[in-house]
């Protein structure tokens, strides 16, 4: 697992300072108050489908 300040967590995960490791954003459904869930909200796990102009 990455240390903070190096490469970001993989897609679908976010860094937890509390646990000192990358954590699954999917777990925020069960534990929405986890520290890393804020990072999940800011970076959706799947790319957006671009709308036609």
């Amino acid at each position: 697992e990455q240390a903070p300040g190096t490469a970001p967590c993989s897609r679908g995960s976010s860094w937890s300072a509390d646990l000192d490791k990358c954590m699954d954003c999917a777990s925020c459904r069960a534990r929405p108050h986890s520290d890393f869930c804020l990072g999940c909200a800011a970076a959706p796990p799947a790319p957006f489908r671009l709308l036609w102009p």
Epitope: L19, D24, C25, A26, S27, R29, A30, A46
Partner: antibody, heavy 119, light 111 residues
Framework: QVQLQQSGGGLVQPGGSMKLSCIAS????????MSWVRQSPEKGLEWVAE??????????HYAESVKGKFTISRDDSKSRFFLQMNNLRAEDTGIYYC??????????WGQGTDLTVSS | DIVMTQTPASLAVSLGQRATISCRAS??????????MHWYQQKPGQPPKLLIK???SLESGVPARFSGSGSGTDFTLNIHPVEEDDTATYYC?????????FGGGTKLEIK
């Protein structure tokens, strides 16, 4: 290195009691939810009970088949948790595993301990 | 309770070929973003070992020969190419709600 070390188990008569213990090391125990999962040839893998973390008010959940019979508890200061089993019956026979989960999947597992309920 | 139905119950696959194991949940275990389905491998005398989480996310340290797919009620575990060491029983598990339930297992034999 993560370890879940189990103790307890053995042979107990129907109607009897048994307490299983699990000591954790190598991860932030207090942040994790802890479960007991049992396995038997008849029922396969069966989730039994869960105790959540302090931030979740140590909420407990049980399989319907063990409600009122089993009690799960934890001691964060010593990184250990327990399963107190009362009024045991033959259908409670199996291998009992302790396991940790942050949420959703069972990440780390103990080595398993055998419980036999028989006269 | 959500019932997990795994097929087949047993499977024999030649070395180097593909093994496909299916798991069907009695109701959807997916949101628009994630599927709450997980796969484990168990060898005799050992506890289960996590392989795949959230339907398709490979657990750290698990070989890329293992892959998972599916959403809603239907999920698949693929192993390709299979190796001798893959002889084991494989289980699916949902975490959509309590009680968490497991499939009945698929015993994989390598020919």
């Amino acid at each position: 290195q993560v370890q879940l070390q189990q103790s307890g188990g053995g042979l107990v008569q129907p109607g009897g009691s048994m307490k299983l213990s699990c000591i954790a090391s190598g991860f932030t125990f207090s942040s994790y939810w802890m479960s007991w999962v049992r396995q038997s040839p008849e029922k396969g893998l069966e989730w039994v009970a869960e105790i959540r973390s302090k931030s979740d008010n140590y909420a407990t959940h049980y399989a319907e088949s063990v409600k009122g019979k089993f009690t799960i508890s934890r001691d964060d200061s010593k990184s250990r948790f327990f399963l107190q089993m009362n009024n045991l019956r033959a259908e409670d026979t199996g291998i009992y595993y302790c396991s940790s989960t942050y949420a959703d999947y069972f990440h780390y597992w103990g080595q398993g301990t055998d419980l036999t309920v028989s006269s | 309770d959500i019932v997990m139905t795994q097929t087949p119950a047993s499977l024999a696959v030649s070395l180097g070929q593909r093994a496909t194991i299916s798991c069907r949940a009695s109701q959807s275990v997916s949101t628009s973003t994630y599927s709450y389905m997980h796969w484990y491998q168990q060898k005799p005398g050992q506890p289960p070992k996590l392989l795949i989480k959230y339907a398709s996310s490979l657990e750290s340290g698990v070989p890329a020969r293992f892959s998972g797919s599916g959403s809603g009620t239907d999920f698949t575990l693929n192993i390709h190419p299979v190796e001798e060491d893959d002889t084991a029983t494989y289980y699916c598990q949902h975490s959509w709600e309590i009680p968490y339930t497991f499939g009945g297992g698929t015993k994989l034999e390598i020919k």
